[in-house]
């Protein structure tokens, strides 16, 4: 049964951030969206291949919530929350979409305190992660995807370079949180950032609502 939907990128699990496969089969039952079935903690999850029983590939579904409790680290000083997806491997476009699906954006770093806080969370890891830096706009120049002002800079030496091919930014543990520009299409881990909004309603991703389902003969939507 085929269904047009926005790809929902998974968090954690064992699928490296790959999107949900909809529908998927779990415990002899077909699911057309994220489910908490089989979980005592109530977290919504999905399979990333059609048959969970066969492949056992899964991840948690992104949730837009007004807190930073699940999957997020909160900086008590600034109230900003951060999500480090070390096990994921997504392009910058996919990483940006994953953050957006959680009411967040890719990481922006606007002051030295924030850089220091991020460096602390990166301690012990060896990784290169997508952040919100990009020069994808024709108006020119590097910018943050969440439109924060680019007032603090931490480029590595000789960076950015190669303007026609490397238009998205990464943060690297190898250079103590220094920034580089890279080809946006390569698959890397990524960091999301959000500011909790007291008025926001928690909304699970019901991206399959009100969508026409097209099924093979003998299948039921």
């Amino acid at each position: 049964c085929a269904l047009p939907y926005h790809e929902v990128y998974t968090i954690q699990g064992n699928s490296h951030g790959k999107p949900c496969t909809i529908p998927f089969k779990y415990d002899n039952q077909w699911f057309h969206g994220c489910t908490s079935t089989g979980r005592e903690d109530g977290h919504l999850w999905c399979a990333t291949t059609q048959d969970y029983g066969k492949d056992e590939r899964w991840g948690f579904c992104p949730i837009k919530s007004n807190d930073c409790e699940t999957f997020w680290d909160k900086d008590q000083l600034t109230d900003s929350c951060y999500q480090f997806n070390f096990q994921s491997t997504l392009s910058w476009r996919e990483a940006w979409a994953s953050c957006e699906q959680q009411g967040a954006d890719l990481l922006s770093i606007t002051e030295i305190h924030e850089q220091t806080y991020i460096n602390g969370l990166l301690t012990g890891y060896s990784s290169t992660l997508w952040i919100g830096l990009n020069d994808l706009d024709t108006s020119g120049g590097w910018q943050w995807s969440d439109n924060s002002p680019l007032k603090y800079l931490n480029w590595e030496s000789d960076q950015p370079d190669n303007p026609s091919e490397e238009n998205c930014g990464v943060i690297r543990t190898e250079s103590s949180g220094g920034w580089q520009n890279r080809d946006c299409s390569i698959a890397l881990p990524y960091v999301c950032k959000k500011k909790p909004n007291a008025t926001a309603e928690p909304t699970p991703p019901d991206r399959w609502a009100n969508v026409k389902v097209e099924c093979e003969p003998s299948w039921q939507p």
Epitope: E7, S91, S164, A187
Partner: antibody, heavy 117, light 108 residues
Framework: EVQLVESGGGLVKPGGSLRLSCAAS????????MNWVRQAPGKGLEWVAN????????HSVDSVKGRFTISRDNSKNSLYLQMNSLRAEDTAVYYC??????????WGQGTLVTVSS | SSELTQDPAVSVALGQTVRITCQGD??????ASWYQQKPGQAPVLVVY???GRPSGIPDRFSGSSSGNTASLTITGAQAEDEADYYC???????????FGGGTKVTVL
């Protein structure tokens, strides 16, 4: 203002050769990869070849491999396409295009190559 | 054959809305760009990345994408929008650019 101006097109017999040129101005040519894109009469756009800023890496579509060579002269702000063993199916308008971020944001006006006996 | 797939032709009544789609594996990892081409002219970039427009492009042109599909929407189509539209994206390191086959938009 970014400008790309192609030249060198014309009528050539099958098996013949042509060298296209693209004169670039208004930007730091040596910082950008450059591309040739073609369009056969009444058909769609087809990427032909690409060259890195320093000329160290070149790629081309399979149908022109071994026949077409892309090159550049950064001191002259110029891009070239040497076309050998031309075939009727190579008849097209050839555009020089500069990439921006994930797009080809500047194009020349094109030069027509006609391969016919 | 194109690495990106577009419908060959669509028509739209003057002032109405038309949506052109483009599908391909490279769109999972890359943003699409859209070009307008009128007869005898070079392609002109109209929409890029998430939903950016170069200066001089009217705001009736907009873009969106999800998964392996990108869309160009013309809201309130004008007679001057009649043209061929091509989608394009970064592709692979050895074949850096992919193009769709083009969609001819006719304004009735």
């Amino acid at each position: 203002e970014v400008q790309l101006v192609e030249s060198g097109g014309g009528l050539v017999k099958p098996g013949g050769s042509l060298r296209l040129s693209c004169a670039a101005s208004g930007f730091t040519f040596s910082s950008y990869s450059m591309n040739w894109v073609r369009q056969a009469p009444g058909k769609g756009l087809e990427w032909v070849a690409n060259i890195k800023p320093d000329g160290s890496e070149r790629h081309s579509v399979d149908s022109v491999k071994g026949r077409f060579t892309i090159s550049r002269d950064n001191s002259k702000n110029s891009l070239y396409l040497q076309m050998n063993s031309l075939r009727a199916e190579d008849t097209a308008v050839y555009y020089c295009a500069r990439p921006g971020a994930g797009r080809l944001d500047y194009w020349g006006q094109g030069t027509l190559v006609t391969v016919s006996s | 054959s194109s690495e990106l797939t577009q419908d060959p032709a669509v028509s739209v009544a003057l002032g109405q809305t038309v949506r052109i789609t483009c599908q391909g594996d490279s769109l999972r990892s890359n943003f699409a760009s859209w070009y307008q081409q009128k007869p005898g002219q070079a392609p002109v970039l109209v929409v890029y990345v998430k939903n950016g427009r170069p200066s001089g492009i009217p705001d009736r042109f907009s873009g969106s994408s999800s998964g392996n599909t990108a869309s160009l929407t013309i809201t309130g189509a004008q007679a001057e929008d009649e043209a061929d539209y091509y989608c394009n994206s970064r592709n692979s390191s050895t074949h850096p650019w992919a193009f769709g086959g083009g969609t001819k938009v006719t304004v009735l």
